[in-house]
């Protein structure tokens, strides 16, 4: 006899990285017929929704209208059908960004390199942080973590055309509180024409939508949860 229901999916809209004082919605998708959803934050009950009519609803939304460092951390959700509870969802790491300062991102030997050259990114932030994150725009979740007193280096090694794209970095004050993003650095890797055509760039987006698509895209996530790449989330753990 089944003792628990399948775990629900949990995600954040527009994104799990939320600028401070901005709104975020935590979505929990379970099953039609669920009479209760519970959202837990850092292990404690945070919110409850009892959708009506339950047979017509399989997703609930928990709003956080004003993101701040107290609201950043790990969330999970569960749901109930009758008296039977689900397994808990995976953990959602909600990160508050735009805290304190803006790092500077630079690249050596430069933003335009030839395939096979060794490339290193440098992220510098003069305030009290020792952890840095380098992120490449797009859904592929290219994330690296680096350490240093005021600067971290991110060696990419010999690059290929797959490395081309737009990069930003953050200083991390703790796992769930990050700085403003650096200005973007676009890495252009030139190679022979055949190779270039085989390595399409990650999707490009207007610069002002940075926060809504970094690491993953809301639409892709909603259409198919299997598309969610856990690289960035796992990095936080």
């Amino acid at each position: 006899q089944q003792q628990t229901l399948p775990k629900p999916f949990i995600w954040a809209e527009p994104h799990f990285m939320v600028p401070k004082e901005k709104q975020v919605t935590i979505c929990c998708q379970g099953n039609y017929g669920a009479v209760e959803y519970q959202l837990h934050f850092e292990g404690s009950l945070f919110a409850v929704d009892r959708p009506k009519p339950p047979e017509r609803i399989n997703k609930v939304q928990f709003y956080i209208p004003d993101m701040n460092s107290r609201m950043a951390g790990q969330y999970s959700c569960i749901y109930r059908v009758g008296e039977l509870w689900s397994e808990p969802s995976n953990l959602l790491d909600l990160v508050v960004t735009e805290m304190y300062d803006t790092p500077t991102l630079s690249v050596h030997p430069g933003p335009e390199v030839i395939s096979g050259e060794k490339v290193t990114f440098y992220c510098r932030l003069d305030t009290a942080t020792s952890m840095f994150l380098l992120l490449k725009e797009g859904r592929s979740s290219h994330v690296q973590r680096g350490y240093g007193k005021v600067q971290a280096e991110f060696p990419l090694g010999p690059v290929t055309t797959a490395h081309r794209g737009t990069y930003r970095c953050f200083g991390s004050y703790n796992n769930h509180a990050w700085s403003f993003p650096s200005e973007p650095v676009k890495l252009l890797v030139t190679g022979d024409i055949e190779n270039t055509s085989l390595a399409p760039e990650d999707p490009t987006f207007p610069a002002d939508t940075w926060g809504t698509y970094l690491l993953t895209t809301e639409t892709g996530l909603q259409k198919d949860h299997a598309l969610w790449d856990h690289t960035a989330q796992n990095l936080l753990r």
Epitope: Q23, T25, F41, S44, L45, F46, A47, V48, D49, R50, P51, K52, V60, Q61, F62, Y63, I64, P65, D66, R70, M71
Partner: nanobody
Framework: EVQLVESGGGLVQPGGSLRLSCAAS????????MAWFRQAPGKGREFVAA????????YYADSMKGRFTISRDNSKNTAYLQMNSLRAEDTAVYYC???????????????????????WGQGTLVTVSS
């Protein structure tokens, strides 16, 4: 901006009843989930009960279930906490709270964590003693 003012506290004997009121100013009150919390002397803040903006969904701390009833009248911009079968351990300052007012909340959602609440009243003291 929402301002909250509690009233109805006082001294009551064990087994007695009290009804607390929370009057809100601000046009958005009727769209905001609300809750009552309490803080006993020398202790931390504790969740008591929560209610959705529509009033159609409520949630209670286990120790208050069956004794306390949360309700609201959006036409009067007021929330209530009816407390029955009061015990000495219910002695505390009772606070009402409302969530931030910039989101379109579900009509059935309640928040149980104090960190979710942006607006707080000044509190009203309830003393249960013989």
């Amino acid at each position: 901006e929402v301002q909250l003012v509690e009233s109805g506290g006082g001294l009551v004997q064990p087994g007695g009843s009290l009804r607390l009121s929370c009057a809100a100013s601000g046009r958005t009150f009727s769209r905001l989930p609300m809750a009552w919390f309490r803080q006993a002397p020398g202790k931390g803040r504790e969740f008591v009960a929560a209610i959705s903006w529509s009033g159609g969904s409520t949630y209670y701390a286990d120790s208050m279930k069956g004794r306390f009833t949360i309700s609201r009248d959006n036409s009067k911009n007021t929330a209530y906490l009816q407390m029955n079968s009061l015990r000495a351990e219910d002695t505390a300052v009772y606070y009402c709270a409302a969530v931030g007012d910039s989101a379109p909340y579900s009509a059935t959602i309640v928040y149980t964590d104090a960190r979710a609440y942006a607006y707080w009243g000044q509190g009203t003291l309830v003393t249960v003693s013989s």
